[in-house]
Amino acid sequence: VPRWRQQWSGPGTTKRFPETVLARCVKYTEIHPEMRHVDCQSVWDAFKGAFISKHPCNITEEDYQPLMKLGTQTVPCNKILLWSRIKDLAHQFTQVQRDMFTLEDTLLGYLADDLTWCGEFNTSKINYQSCPDWRKDCSNNPVSVFWKTVSRRFAEAACDVVHVMLNGSRSKIFDKNSTFGSVEVHNLQPEKVQTLEAWVIHGGREDSRDLCQDPTIKELESIISKRNIQFSCKNIYRPDKFLQCVKNPEDSSCTSEI
C-alpha cells in the first residue's frame, strides 16, 4: 500500500542532493586550502541531521547549529557584499574582485546555493516530490530557516563599510520581505558597521534616472539611519561596463561614470 505523502506547494528536493552537497564540499576544500581541515562527510551528516525525520514546517535555527559549528568560517569583515534579487551580478563581481565576498563565497553558502531540500516527519527519507513554499505553506521550512540562519550570521560578522547590490529593474528596489530586508539589514551591528553603501544596478541601457531617489531606497536609508549606521547610494548605470572596469581599472573609459 503506497504511503500517503504530504503534498507541498513548492518544488521537491533537488535531485542528487546528498551527492551534490558532498561534491561541493570537496571542491570547496580543494579550492580553499585553509578549509581542508573540514571533514565533508561530517558536514553532510550535520546538514542531513538538520532536516531529516523532522516536520518540514517545524525547522528551527537550533537544528542547524551543528552544521554552523562545522562550517564556521570568517571572511574579512570589511569586504562583505550583500545582494538582493541580483545574485548573478553579485557573484560575477566577487569572482573578479577577489577580495570581496558574498555569502555564497563561504562554505555553507556555496554548499546550498540554488538547492532545495526537505524531509518528512518520522521517516529518514528525503522528499524529492515537493517541499513547503515559504508563502503558500510555511516559513519555518528547511531552506528558509537555513538561509535565515547563515544570512544573520554573515550580517553580524560585517564591519566598516558594507556594500549591497540591489536590482534597479524591480518595482521594489529595496524589498522589506527579502532576506536582505528582513534579516541582514536588522543584523548589521552598529558598533562595528560604519556605513551601508547601496549599489543600485540599472537594467535598461537608456535608463539615466537617479534610482537612489526611489521611495524604497529612502525607506532603506531611514531603517539604516535609525540603527545609527550611515547610508550611501550609488547608481550603476552600466553593469556590463562596471564589471569590465573592475577587471581593467586602468582602462581610459573607466574614469567616466558607470
Epitope: K27, I31, P33, H37, R98, D105, T106
Partner: antibody, heavy 120, light 111 residues
C-alpha cells in the same frame, strides 16, 4: 598593523618537549588560520600545519602529525606549537605565519622566528 | 606529496642583469583556473617575504621588476633588472594539495 611576536630561543634536551608561542595583534585573531613553518639549517622551509582559532580546526603535515600539537588561546590572541619527543634534527628556526584568509591562502605575515636547539 | 624542484640551486649575477628562477612541480598545481603557486624572498636572519601569489600576481609593495609566470607544473620567477637588495634566497611554495610544500630554494648571489 598586523604583528606576530614569537617567544624567545629555547635549548632543550633530546626526548623532551618544547612549546613555542606566537602572539598576534592588529587583526581579529579568530578570523584567520595560523600556520607554522620549520627552517632547519641548510634544509629550506617545511610546512608543519595550521590551526583555525575561530573553530579550533587543525590540519597537520603527516610528517609532524603526532609530534606537533597546535593550539590557540583566543582570549590572549596567542597560538602555540608544541613539539614532543625532540631529536637533533628538530633543531631549527620555527616561524608562525598568517595568510590573507579566504581566497588569499599564501603567507603574507610572519613572526620573527624562534630558534629551538636540541642538545644534550 | 607534491615535490617542488627549483633550479638553479645557486645563481651568480650582477646588478642590472636579469635573473630567471625555475620551479617544477611533480604534478600540476593549477586547478579551477587558479595557480596555487607562490614565491618568497628570504634574507639571513629574517622571515620569508611574499613576492608573488597565484603564480603571477605581485604582492602589495613588491616592485614591478619582480614577475611570475607559468601554470600546471612549470613556473618561473623573473627579476629584471637586478638591484643590490635583491640578492637573497628565493623559494617557491604550493598549496594545491596538502601538505603545503616549498622548493629547496635558489640562492641568488652577487657575481
Amino acid at each position: 598593523q598586523v604583528q606576530l611576536v614569537q617567544s624567545g630561543a629555547e635549548v632543550v634536551k633530546p626526548g623532551a618537549s618544547v612549546k613555542v608561542s606566537c602572539k598576534a595583534s592588529g587583526y581579529t585573531f579568530t578570523s584567520y588560520a595560523m600556520h607554522w613553518v620549520k627552517e632547519a639549517p641548510g634544509q629550506g622551509l617545511e610546512w608543519i600545519g595550521y590551526i583555525y582559532p575561530g573553530q579550533g580546526g587543525t590540519n597537520y603535515n603527516q610528517k609532524f602529525q603526532g609530534r606537533a600539537t597546535l593550539t590557540a588561546d583566543t582570549s590572549a590572541s596567542t597560538a602555540y606549537m608544541e613539539l614532543s619527543s625532540l631529536r637533533s634534527e628538530d633543531t631549527a628556526v620555527y616561524f608562525c605565519a598568517r595568510t590573507g584568509g579566504l581566497r588569499r591562502a599564501y603567507f603574507t605575515y610572519w613572526g620573527q622566528g624562534t630558534l629551538v636547539t636540541v642538545s644534550s | 606529496d607534491i615535490v617542488l624542484t627549483q633550479s638553479p640551486a645557486t645563481l651568480s649575477l650582477s646588478p642590472g642583469e636579469r635573473a630567471t628562477i625555475s620551479c617544477r612541480a611533480s604534478q600540476s598545481v593549477s586547478s579551477y583556473g587558479q595557480g596555487f603557486m607562490h614565491w618568497y624572498q628570504q634574507k639571513p636572519g629574517q622571515p620569508p617575504r611574499l613576492l608573488i601569489y597565484g603564480a603571477s600576481s605581485r604582492a602589495t609593495g613588491i616592485p614591478a621588476r619582480f614577475s611570475g609566470s607559468g601554470s600546471g607544473t612549470d613556473f618561473t620567477l623573473t627579476i629584471s633588472p637586478l638591484e643590490p637588495e635583491d640578492f637573497a634566497v628565493y623559494y617557491c611554495q604550493q598549496n594545491k594539495e596538502d601538505p603545503w610544500t616549498f622548493g629547496g630554494g635558489t640562492k641568488l648571489e652577487i657575481k
